[in-house]
C-alpha cells in the first residue's frame, strides 16, 4: 500500500494473507467459513510451492492470539484466467477446515448486485505490499482509503486504455494506491467486499494509471458455483 | 460488435446551426470517451474535442470551444454535436471516435457542407 | 500546442518498395506517466481512419507485420517494409500525450 497508513489492529477480521512457503505473497479476503477469495495470477510461479493462508494476523512476524496459518485443501482459478491478460483474476482458495471465527476472524459480505460503484465513492484497500517505491515490505496491515474512478476515465488512451471491461473497476493512484504484494486483497467500500485487487505488474502511484481491480458482483454465479 | 453511426450532416447557410449524432452499439456507452474529429475536403484530421460519458465532462480544442458544445443521452447511447454560427470554413466531414484502445473505432463520417 | 510535422507530403512508390514515413512533434510528446502516445492512421478516400500503430511501435490487432513504428522524444517513422497494393492510402501521425491532441497534415503514397 502506497501513502497509507498502518491498519488498526484486526479491525478487518476478513483480512487474509496469502502465503508461500511461509513467506506472505498476495492479499486475500475470508468470505466464507472455508474459502479465501484472492488474484488468480498469484499463484502462477508457486509451481510445487506449499500455498497456505494466515488468518487472524496484523503483523506477519509476532506472535498473535488470533493468528493462525491454514492449509489450502484446493485450489480453484477461474477457468477464464490467463496469465497475460487481467481479465478474470480471481481464486478461490478452499482451507483444510472451517476457519475458528472471532472478533478477529471474520468473513465479509461481497456485493451481489452487478452495478457499478458510483465515482468517487471513498472505498479502502488493505494488504501487506510493498509501501514505497524502493519496495519495503510493512510487517504490520496497511490501508488507504482511494476513490473510485469513472471506467472511461480509466480506459483513456493515458491510463489503460480499452483495457477496463464491465468486469473491472478502478481507482485513483495519486501517491495513494495498492501495489505489489497487494494483489488478491479486498476493496471494501460501505463495508461490503466491491473488488479484489488485480494482480498485473502495474506501475503503482502514478496517477495516470489507475488501481485495477475485479469487480465481485460480475462473479457472483462463479463463486457461488464454487463455494456450493 | 463495435458501430458508431453519424447522421444529422447536410446543407446549412452561414451563420445557421446543425446538430450531429453519434449512435454507438455494440458495447457499453458509458466505459469509454467519445471524441469528435473533423476533415475538411481534400485536408488533413483536426480534434475537435472530447466527452465523458459518465460524468459528462468537456474537453474542447480552443479553435471550437466558443461555437461548438458536446451533448450526451446515455439513454440512447448517443452522443451529440451542436454546432452554432457555420462558416464556410466548417464545411468538412465530421466523425466520432471512441477513445480507448486509442481511436480504434470511428464512424463513417457525415458531410456538413456551409455554403448559400 | 503541439505541431506534428509529417515528410514527404507525398511519395510515389511501387509495389514491393520499402516506403518510410517521419513526424517530428515541435517537442516532446513523452507523457507524465512515462509513456509516449504517438499513433499511426491509414486513411483511404471516402473512409474513416484505421488505427495501424500505437504508443510508438505497438501494432494495433490485425495490422500487418509489414507495418513497423519507431522513434522516441521528437522524432517518429512510420515503415512499411513491403508495399502492397492495397497500402496506397494517406498515412496519419497523432499524438495523444498532450491536450490538444493534435495529427500530422498526412503523407499520400500513390502509385509510381
Known amino acids: 500500500i502506497l501513502g497509507g497508513r498502518e491498519a488498526e489492529a484486526h479491525a478487518r477480521p476478513y483480512m487474509a494473507s496469502v502465503q508461500l512457503n511461509g513467506a506472505h505473497l498476495c492479499g486475500g479476503v475470508l468470505v466464507a467459513e472455508q474459502w479465501v477469495l484472492s488474484a488468480a495470477h498469484c499463484l502462477e510461479d508457486a509451481a510445487d510451492g506449499k500455498v497456505q493462508v494466515l488468518l487472524g494476523a496484523h503483523s506477519l512476524s509476532q506472535p498473535e492470539p488470533s493468528k493462525r496459518l491454514y492449509d489450502v485443501l484446493r485450489a480453484v482459478p477461474h477457468p477464464d484466467s490467463q496469465p497475460d491478460t487481467i481479465d478474470h483474476d480471481l481464486l478461490l482458495l478452499q482451507l483444510s477446515e472451517k476457519a475458528t471465527l472471532g472478533p478477529a476472524v471474520r468473513p465479509l459480505p461481497w456485493q451481489r448486485v452487478d452495478r457499478d460503484v458510483a465515482p468517487g465513492t471513498l472505498c479502502d484497500v488493505a494488504g501487506w505490499g510493498i509501501v514505497n517505491h524502493a519496495g519495503r515490505r510493512p510487517d504490520s496491515l496497511q490501508h488507504v482509503l482511494l476513490p473510485v474512478l469513472d471506467r472511461a476515465t480509466c480506459n483513456r488512451r493515458t491510463h489503460h486504455d480499452g483495457a477496463i471491461t464491465e468486469r473491472l473497476m478502478c481507482a485513483e493512484s495519486n501517491r495513494r494506491d495498492s501495489c505489489k504484494g497487494d494483489s488478491g486483497g479486498p476493496l471494501v467500500c460501505g463495508g461490503v467486499l466491491e473488488g479484489v485487487v488485480t494482480s498485473g505488474s502495474r506501475v503503482c502511484g502514478n496517477r495516470k494509471k489507475p488501481g485495477i481491480y475485479t469487480r465481485v458482483a460480475s462473479y457472483a454465479a462463479w463463486i457461488d458455483s464454487v463455494l456450493a | 460488435e463495435v458501430q458508431l453511426v453519424e447522421s444529422g450532416g447536410g446543407l446549412v447557410q452561414p451563420g445557421g446551426s446543425l446538430r450531429l449524432s453519434c449512435a454507438a452499439s455494440g458495447y457499453v456507452f458509458t466505459s469509454y470517451y467519445m471524441n469528435w474529429v473533423r476533415q475538411a475536403p481534400g485536408k488533413g484530421l483536426e480534434w475537435i474535442g472530447d466527452?465523458?460519458?459518465?460524468?459528462?465532462?468537456?474537453d474542447y480544442n480552443a479553435d471550437f470551444k466558443r461555437r461548438f458544445t458536446f451533448s450526451l443521452d446515455t439513454s440512447k447511447s448517443t452522443a451529440y454535436l451542436q454546432m452554432n454560427s457555420l462558416r464556410a470554413e466548417d464545411t468538412a466531414v465530421y466523425y466520432c471516435t471512441r477513445e480507448g484502445p486509442s481511436f480504434a473505432y470511428w464512424g463513417q463520417g457525415t458531410l456538413v457542407t456551409v455554403s448559400s | 500546442d503541439i505541431q506534428l510535422t509529417q515528410s514527404p507530403s507525398s511519395l510515389s512508390a511501387s509495389v514491393g518498395d520499402r516506403v518510410t514515413i517521419t513526424c517530428r512533434s515541435s517537442q516532446t510528446i513523452v507523457h507524465s506517466n512515462g509513456d509516449t502516445y504517438l499513433e499511426w492512421y491509414q486513411q483511404k478516400p471516402g473512409k474513416a481512419p484505421n488505427l495501424l500503430i500505437y504508443k510508438v511501435s505497438n501494432r494495433f490487432s490485425g495490422v500487418p507485420s509489414r507495418f513497423s513504428g519507431s522513434g522516441s522524444g521528437t522524432d517518429f517513422t512510420l515503415t512499411i517494409s513491403s508495399l502492397q497494393p492495397e497500402d496506397f492510402a494517406t498515412y496519419y501521425c497523432?499524438?495523444?500525450?498532450?491536450?490538444?491532441?493534435?495529427f500530422g497534415q498526412g503523407t499520400k503514397v500513390e502509385i509510381k
Open positions: 497523432f499524438q495523444g500525450s498532450h491536450v490538444p491532441v493534435t
Open positions: 466527452i465523458n460519458p459518465v460524468t459528462g465532462d468537456t
